[in-house]
Structures are given as C-alpha cells and as structure tokens.
C-alpha cells in the first residue's frame, strides 16, 4: 500500500534548485529498481516531476497560492519489466501554503462622498473596503486594518469596518468645501511587516442653511417718472447669502413705509434680485418721495439653525418721483348727461371739468371734437365746460348722442385730453299714435248689424315706458251718422262694427271713416286716421264677389259719413 496522503508546498519559492515536494513510496518497493513510479494529473511532467526510481517529487516553477491553491495528481507504481501495477492508482493532493505576498487592495482607487456641513461629530460619510488576496483562513496575511493617513482632524476611520466619519464639530462649507482624505489598509492585523495599500477619498461638504441673507448696503435710492405705468421696474436690490442652492434663495417683501401701497417688490428667480416695481399710478403733484422698508428672507429655513439669528435682513429704499408734464385730467372717465327732447336751443345740459395735474396748474380750454358731432348739435363753453344744445333734438331720430370733448392746456396746446360724453335724449310725448297699417276693409251688402268687419291697431313712435295705452273713437263729425260704429276694446285695439242691416253699393260704394286715436300719456297726442270701407256683393256664404266701382251700373257715391 501507498505510504503517503498529501503534500504541502510553500508558495513563491525563490531558491535556485527545484523545490522539493515529497516522496511517493510503495511498501512493495524493495529498492532493487524493479518498480517504476509514474505521476499524472494537474501539472504532472511540467510543473511537477517525479524520479521514477525513487518516487521523489519536485516543483519546477515558482507557485502562487493566489493563482492555484491546490493541485490534484494521481500516482502509479508499476513493475518495470511487465508494466503491471503493483499498487492500485491513487489520487493525492498538493496544497500550496500561503505566505503574505499580497497587499490589501481597495475596491476603488478614488472614492467621492458628501456630508452636510455643520454635521455632528461621528456622522457617517462613506465606507471604504479593501480586499487581500492572501489566505484568510491561515495566519493574519489577509486580516486588514484601516487607518487614516491624511484628513485629520476632520475625519476618522473605523479600523475594522473602513467607515469614515466626521471628527470635527462645526465644519463650515463656507470656510472650506473640499477635503482629500487618504486611507491606508494594512494586513497582518496592522502589525509590523504587514503589507498595505491606500486610497483617496474626496469629500465635499454639502450646504445647509446656516447663513442669513445680508444687504450689502443699508439704503438704496431710485428715481422714476410719474408717468411710469403699473408694473414698470424702477430698480434692483440684491442681498447676498453665503449659502448655495435653495438655501441661498431669497424672497423680497415690502414690510413698511409710506409707499407700500404704491410699489411692489418681486423676486427675480434667476438672479435672486429684488425688483422694485410701480404698483399704482404715481402723481408727482401728490407725493414726490417715498420711503420703503424692504426685507430679504430665506424661504427655506432649517429649524436647528434658528439659534444663529433671524434669517432675514432689511434695507431702506428711497424712491424719488420725477415730474412729467401731463395732459389735463377730466373729473370723470366718461360723462353721462340727459336732456329732454323738447329742449330749446341753448339749453344747458351739464358740464365737464378738467384740470392740469401738474404743479404749474396751466389753465384749460374746452372744445367739442367735431368728428363726433358733425351736425353741430351741441356746443361747449370753452372756459367753463358747460355743454348746451345748438339745434333741436328728436329722441325718435336719435336716442343717444356720443360725442367727445377735448380739454387743451392753453399754455401748451400739445397737452390735451379727450373724454367721451354720452347724452341721452329723454322722451317727451310728442308723437301722436297712428294706424299700424293702411286699413281698407269690405262689408257685404247683406251684412247684419253689429257685425265686426275690421280690427284696428295703432303704433306710437314715443318711448313705450311700460307699453302704450291707446283710445279709439269715430271723429265727432262722423259719430252722428248711423252706418258704422267703433268699439274700443281697451286693449289697444278697436273694432269697426256695422250699425245697420244691409248696405246698397249702388247708393254708396265706399265709406271713409275718420277714426281719432289718442294716447293716454301726457302731453296728450292724438291723430285722425281714415279707414276705407267698400261695399261688396257677396255670395250666401259671405264671400266677396264684386267690389269694384266700375262693375256698378249707377254712378258711385263717396261718403265720409259713418
């Protein structure tokens, strides 16, 4: 049987001779050279050679455990003469023994990390990791210990975990933002003779809101013309903040001062400036100088830094209003006047008033824009602005007159203003009602008394304040006749009724009925309209057959009698 089990071989042999591994030996070997040892398997004949007579095994090359820690080979012992095995083939291993020939290597050449400024001591920053290729199961060749070579007193590293933490209180990004830390990893548990590797950790302090905004000056002064429309920017102010990003964002507001009604401040999000703008129309003549208190504040405040003081600052803004020569200003944006349509010429309707708003208070003259009053219906007193009629009015022709009045500075005619003037013509009951249409109606010769032959309607050009009320009657001169009557229906209609049985068209072919129509308003208006009634021949159903005068045998008569 074989006299071995496994062999151990130290890696990285540096001797000039082959490295002796061990000896294969069978108890069948009598030492007479009759046995022959044969080696096969991992590296046999190349890496490992055997003396076929003695069974001595040697390694021909330097071995590296980290490359291959175990070799599996097979051994044979055969009769040299017959070639027959004297032992069954057997497997054995060569185990490569570790030496500390590998330094720890970090997973990254350079680490980058961030940590908030002003972080508490011991705040986690980053964990670095180094690996050692040596055998961790044997000795301390792979036992790594971390230490800081550069970066103290700001940071520390946990020796066993490689966790880097802050080591100094109140690290201020605004003082220093970047740190380069060098970490060493050493094997052999950090003992003398151990191998080591290093890595660089670039640490950036991130910003926290630990700085308030600050105005670089306590007072600002701007000028703006009084003509600046609302929304006009008149100046920019900027508070500085040592922080960055949202911690440096600033909101501006007007907190006090006599001008906070007149001005606004808006924040320019890109430049973080406060833009002072006009909020309401300015008037040099009313106020020439405004003083505002403007505040700059951080909208994003960290409560834990509130003890550092208020995160806001204020400055005084002085705004000087410059005078602008302005046109006259009317007392109203538009004037609405009323006048009765029966007003006589030169009737005063009302007046307009304009004033030079400038300190000079230049006198003003008034005129009517004739493009808006081509017919010269109205006039204006150039001195006092009184509007009066220069022609007669008629509401039924035009209800509203829309004219424009101009006010011009006498000393500076270039400065003028216009104002619309809406003149409503009030209704006077000055139109009589009249028939809604021309009425020509027909009556059958055989008509019976009290037969309705026509319904009358009237219209009135006057303003139907709530609807006209009309009355109808036969004119007095016709009322005594007994041919037709009018029945006022009291609903603004009236009916013409026959007043007798039968009409003879040979005697009278046409009747002209004068009808008086009156409105029930004041002043009372009435008119007389004429209704023509033709006498016709009809069939027994009452259908007209012949009404024409030329069809009659006898000369026709024409009567105004009703």
């Amino acid at each position: 049987s074989w006299m071995w089990n496994q062999f151990f071989l130290l890696e990285e042999y540096t001797g000039s001779d082959y490295q002796y591994v061990g000896k294969l030996h069978s108890d069948q070997d009598r030492g007479d050279g009759s046995l022959k040892y044969i080696l096969s398997g991992d590296g046999a004949g190349d890496l490992f050679i055997i003396n076929e007579n003695t069974g001595d095994i040697q390694a021909t090359k330097r071995l590296d455990r980290e490359e291959k820690p175990v070799y599996i080979l097979r051994a044979q012992a055969v009769n040299r003469r017959t070639g027959r095995p004297v032992e069954p083939e057997s497997e054995f291993i060569i185990k490569i023994h570790d030496i500390n020939d590998n330094e720890p290597i970090f997973t990254k050449d350079v680490y980058t990390a961030t940590v908030p400024e002003m972080a508490d001591v011991g705040t986690f920053v980053v964990q670095v990791t180094a690996t050692d290729a040596d055998d961790p199961t044997y000795g301390n060749s792979a036992k790594v210990v971390y230490s800081i070579l550069q970066g103290q007193p700001y940071f520390s590293v946990e020796s066993e975990t490689g966790i880097i933490k802050t080591a100094l209180l109140n690290m201020d990004r605004e003082n220093r933002e970047q740190y380069q830390v060098v970490i060493q990893a050493k094997d052999m548990g950090g003992q003398m003779g151990g191998l080591s590797g290093t890595t660089t950790v670039n640490i950036t302090l991130t910003d926290v809101n630990d700085n308030p905004p600050r105005f670089p000056q306590s007072t600002y002064q701007f000028k703006t013309p009084e003509s600046s429309p609302p929304g006009t920017p008149i100046g920019r102010i900027k508070a500085s903040d040592a922080d960055v990003g949202e911690n440096a964002e600033i909101e501006y507001s007007i907190t006090d001062g006599e001008g906070h009604e007149m001005f606004d401040v808006i924040t320019d999000q890109e430049t973080q400036e406060g833009i002072i703008t006009v909020k309401k129309l300015l008037d040099f003549e009313k106020k020439k100088v405004y003083t505002l208190k403007v505040e700059a504040s951080n909208p994003h405040v960290e409560p834990r830094f509130l003890y550092l003081g208020p995160f806001k600052d204020s400055a005084t803004v002085r705004i000087v209003v410059d005078d602008v020569d302005e046109p006259p200003v009317f007392s109203k944006l538009a004037y609405i006047l009323q006048i009765r349509e029966d007003a006589r010429i030169n009737t005063t309707i009302g007046s307009v008033a304009a004033q030079d708003p400038d300190a000079a208070r230049n006198p003003v003259k008034y005129s009517v824009d004739r493009h808006t009053d081509m017919d010269r219906i109205f006039n204006i007193d150039s001195g006092n602005g009184s509007i009066f009629t220069s022609k007669l009015l008629d509401r039924e022709t035009l209800l509203w007159h829309n004219i424009t009045v101009i006010a011009t500075e006498i000393n500076n005619p270039k400065q003028s203003s216009r104002v619309p003037l809406y003149i409503k013509v009030l209704d006077v009951n000055d139109n009589a009602p009249e028939f809604a249409e021309f009425y020509e109606t027909f009556v059958c010769e055989k008509a019976k008394a009290d037969q309705l032959i026509q319904t009358l309607r009237a219209v009135d050009k006057d303003d139907p304040y709530s609807g006209h009320q009309f009355s109808f009657s036969l004119a007095p001169e016709a009322a005594s006749s007994s041919n037709f009557t009018i029945q006022d229906n009291k609903d603004n209609t009236a009916g013409i009724l026959t007043r007798k049985n039968g009409y003879n068209r040979h005697e009278m072919s046409t009747y002209l009925l004068p009808v008086v129509i009156s409105d029930n308003d004041y002043p009372v208006q009435s008119s007389t309209g004429t209704v023509t009634v033709r006498v016709c021949a009809c069939d027994h159903h009452g259908n007209m057959q012949s009404c024409h005068a030329e069809a009659l045998i006898h000369p026709t008569g024409l009567s105004t009698g009703a």
Epitope: D427, Y465, S466, S471
Partner: antibody, heavy 118, light 111 residues
Framework: QVQLLESGGGLVQPGGSLRLSCAAS????????MNWVRQAPGKGLEWVSV????????NYADSVKGRFTISRDNSKNTLYLQMNSLRAEDTAVYYC???????????WGQGTLVTVSS | DIVLTQPPSVSGAPGQRVTISCSGS????????VSWYQQLPGTAPKLLIY???NRPSGVPDRFSGSKSGTSASLAITGLQAEDEADYYC???????????FGGGTKLTVLG
C-alpha cells in the same frame, strides 16, 4: 279691479308743507299718466297737476305752480304730491285720478282732506 | 278759475227728461272730446260719459251725451230720485295741456 287710495292729508298751518300719496293697484300703473284734482268745500272740481307715465313730463294749474310738485315711483305704483307754502285757499279734498279714454278720468280715489288753517 | 260754463242747477220731476249744457272754447271742447262726471253727496266723482257720447259699462242708457262745435250737453231721460247729484263736464285743453272742468250743475229731482 282698479283701485286708487290717497293718504297724507291733514291739518297744516299756512306756509306749511304736506306730502300726499296715492297707491295704485289693479292696472299697469307705469303705462298711464296720472292727475291730481281737488274740490274745495262746497265748490266744484279743479284740476291741479298731471305727470306723464315715465315721470319726465309734468304740468300744474297756475294756482299751484311753483309751490306743488308732482312725482311718481313706478316701482312702488305710487303717485305723490308735495305741497309747500300752503295757503288757506288750498283747503280741499284732493283726489288722484287716472286719465284714460280720450282724457276722461275713468278711475278716482276716495280723496284725502287737506285743511290749511292757523 | 272755471273755464267751462255750466248752469248752476237744473231740476225735473221723476220720469222727465233734463239736459245740462256745457260750453267751452276751440282749444278745449272745440278740438277735444268731452266727458261727464256724476258726484253723489259725500263721494268721489264717477265717470258717466266719455268720448262725447260713450257710456262706460254699468251706466244706464238713460244718460246720453252729445257735442257740437265748442258746446256739449248731457241728457237724462226717465229721471229717477237717485239721479239727484252734482254733474260736471270736462275736457282736455290743447292750448296749455291741462284739464278743464265746468263749475258743476246741481240736479234736483222734484217731488
């Protein structure tokens, strides 16, 4: 049905003022002109004043011109007569009346007595 | 001041016919319609005749009106005791846009 109801009469000293009201119902008040007519004790009827349907036109008897003012509020269906600088000869029953068919006064109120006396 | 002229009083026995005249001018009766009012003692006037000769509903046909030129008249036939009242004629005046009344006529039913 049409109704006219006067109020506001009473005893007043010469030079004093009174305001009469006439509440109308049963018709479209704003479509009709309206009259005040008075009747002194034992005397005949005397027309006093008229106002157009919209209130824009008014007229007065010479005897009251400059002292009396007629007005109306169409939203309240009410006619008014403001009487200032009253005289003894203004003592009368005051009627409001609606002029209709060809200016005939078809409806009258029951009247309100105004007495001007010291 | 009274513009239309009426007789102060008229009388008649029951069943009789009486007429009351009313005269004016061209600016009132001459160019406008006449209306007549009846005023019973202690009551408001009541429209009796309009448009010269028309009767409002409810007025008996014993009452009739007429107009000629600048005059008008009211006729009452079949006189009854309840007709005893004051009667006034009236017209619109186109000259000064006012209403004018007669001085009133007291009708007495005899017996």
């Amino acid at each position: 049905q049409v109704q006219l109801l006067e109020s506001g009469g009473g005893l007043v000293q010469p030079g004093g003022s009174l305001r009469l009201s006439c509440a109308a119902s049963g018709f479209t008040f704003s479509s009709f002109a309206m009259n005040w007519v008075r009747q002194a004790p034992g005397k005949g009827l005397e027309w006093v004043s008229v106002i157009s349907s919209s209130g824009s036109n008014t007229n007065y008897a010479d005897s009251v011109k400059g002292r009396f003012t007629i007005s109306r509020d169409n939203s309240k269906n009410t006619l008014y007569l403001q009487m200032n600088s009253l005289r003894a000869e203004d003592t009368a029953v005051y009627y409001c009346a609606r002029p209709s068919y060809f200016q005939a006064m078809d409806y009258w109120g029951q009247g309100t007595l105004v007495t001007v006396s010291s | 001041d009274i513009v239309l002229t009426q007789p102060p009083s008229v009388s008649g026995a029951p069943g009789q016919r009486v007429t009351i005249s009313c005269s004016g001018s061209s600016s009132n009766i001459g160019s406008n319609f006449v209306s007549w009012y009846q005023q019973l003692p202690g009551t408001a006037p009541k429209l009796l005749i309009y448009d010269n000769s028309n009767r409002p509903s409810g007025v008996p046909d014993r009452f009739s009106g007429s107009k000629s030129g600048t005059s008008a008249s009211l006729a009452i036939t079949g006189l009854q005791a309840e007709d005893e009242a004051d009667y006034y004629c009236s017209s619109y005046d186109s000259f000064d846009h006012s209403w004018v009344f007669g001085g009133g006529t007291k009708l007495t039913v005899l017996g």
